[in-house]
Interface confidence: low
Amino acid sequence: SGVFQLQLQEFINERGVLASGRPCEPGCRTFFRVCLKHFQAVVSPGPCTFGTVSTPVLGTNSFAVRDDSSGGGRNPLQLPFNFTWPGTFSLIIEAWHAPGDDLRPEALPPDALISKIAIQGSLAVGQNWRTDEQNDTLTRLSYSYRVICSDNYYGESCSRLCKKRDDHFGHYECQPDGSLSCLPGWTGKYCDQPICLSGCHEQNGYCSKPDECICRPGWQGRLCNECIPHNGCRHGTCSIPWQCACDEGWGGLFCDQDLNYCTHHSPCKNGSTCSNSGPKGYTCTCLPGYTGEHCEL
């Protein structure tokens, strides 16, 4: 999809005459009809397959055509197409005399054609204008033309569609050649894969949007590199998820059984000796003169 643009620059009709040689009265009030069609070795009658456009009356006899792209877009003339640009074309430009304000073909007198030019050839897509001048015995037309791609279309034939987007289907802008340029935080062929938080563990973490690090089951921490011990693990750690490796002095499935009661609780009194004897088990050996379970008597 693209646009063939035609910039009319100057039309010279010094004698103010029609193609028949008859003079216009009072002067040739000139407008143009443009027909753009597929390449023909000899431009032939038939539909304007690539489009057609007409101008209002632009001047009388000889005149320069001002650039009016800001005020209504009349010059350059726009001939949009919605197909792959083939690289070749035929262009017919007719200058007509309009005695009145009605420019419809049926409203014009039978002898209203001033001049007709037909060119054909190759034209690549690009920003640069190609300038041309066509003369016949009575008139001269100077003009420039080019083909540019429509918005969101790129490439040598304006066939590469790239519409910048920032939604579920992708997060990208378009390069001049139509290739995708991912927005920050996104990667992948279609820029639909988020780049996770820097350092996010490759196996244990993932993300659904950029700079995120969502932990898989069994992992925790900002970078999902810390395992989660077994639920209920009291005095233990893990090296893999759901493990409960007991700290020194603790035992049992949940590391909640005290294997060092004497040290942690000092239950024996009056200088007696404490001996650990299994989980939460201990015995006090009293000094002479003391008795009781904790040598408290």
Epitope: K163, K164, R165, D167, F169, Y190
Partner: antibody, heavy 119, light 111 residues
Framework: EVQLQQSGPELVKTGASVKISCKAS????????IHWVKQSHGKSLEWIGY????????NYNQKFKGKATFTVDTSSSTAFMQFNSLTSEDSAVYYC????????????WGQGTSVTVSS | DIVLTQSPASLAVSLGQRATISCRAS??????????MKWFQQKPGQPPKLLIY???NQGSGVPARFSGSGSGTDFSLNIHPMEEDDTAMYFC?????????FGGGTKLEIK
């Protein structure tokens, strides 16, 4: 003339799988996407997902992930949808539809394939 | 998921009169200046047929009596003048976000 011709009705047992085909003609198959849509009896339409006929990229409705699998065979211009572990809830008419760009939509549809799941 | 609520659920309109069907989205379905809203017609035993895309653009070969309007969350389908052939179910559908979703449908009949 653009046409999408779907395979015939299916009567399948609970727990089985079914593979529906959608043969395209009359247009450039690989330039388009094929969508799959479910319509339970007397109910609205439910989008299952789509597959790119160009590169096989898929996008599924989360509800049907693991249930539906899309494939294409570009040599025969045919799209397929396999539906697994069928239950009575999967009894419905399934349509394929083509799409060229997200701004136009599903402009041509297959005639629909009726799937009946029986115990 | 974006929920589309159609109203009314059923509608009876006299021949030659105007039928208006509404579709409200639970959130905006506009993106980059485009409304990702479509309208489909479905007759019994037939697949849906695309009527309107991008909220207001007519599908290929769709009669001019079908027109769509709206943006953001509120959309409508107008049929005028109503013809006998227009008796059908009508569905709106959004394609802004996955999963694409359809409205519950409106049954249009001749009064």
């Amino acid at each position: 003339e653009v046409q999408l011709q779907q395979s015939g009705p299916e009567l399948v047992k609970t727990g089985a799988s079914v593979k529906i085909s959608c043969k395209a003609s009359g247009y450039s198959f690989t330039a388009y996407y094929i969508h799959w849509v479910k319509q339970s009896h007397g109910k609205s339409l439910e989008w299952i997902g789509y597959i790119s006929c160009y590169n096989g990229a898929t996008n599924y409705n989360q509800k049907f992930k693991g249930k539906a699998t899309f494939t294409v065979d570009t040599s025969s211009s045919t799209a397929f949808m396999q539906f697994n572990s069928l239950t009575s809830e999967d009894s419905a008419v399934y349509y394929c539809a083509r799409d060229y760009d997200y701004d136009v939509g599903m402009d041509y549809w297959g005639q629909g394939t009726s799937v009946t799941v029986s115990s | 998921d974006i929920v589309l609520t159609q109203s009314p659920a059923s509608l009876a309109v006299s021949l030659g009169q105007r039928a208006t069907i509404s579709c409200r989205a639970s959130e905006s379905v506009d993106n980059y200046g485009i409304s990702f809203m479509k309208w489909f017609q479905q007759k019994p035993g037939q697949p849906p047929k695309l009527l309107i895309y991008a909220a207001s653009n007519q599908g290929s070969g769709v009669p001019a009596r079908f027109s769509g309007s709206g943006s953001g969350t509120d959309f409508s389908l107008n049929i005028h003048p109503m013809e006998e052939d227009d008796t059908a179910m009508y569905f709106c559908q959004q394609s802004k976000e996955v999963p694409w979703t359809f409205g519950g449908g409106t049954k249009l009949e001749i009064k």
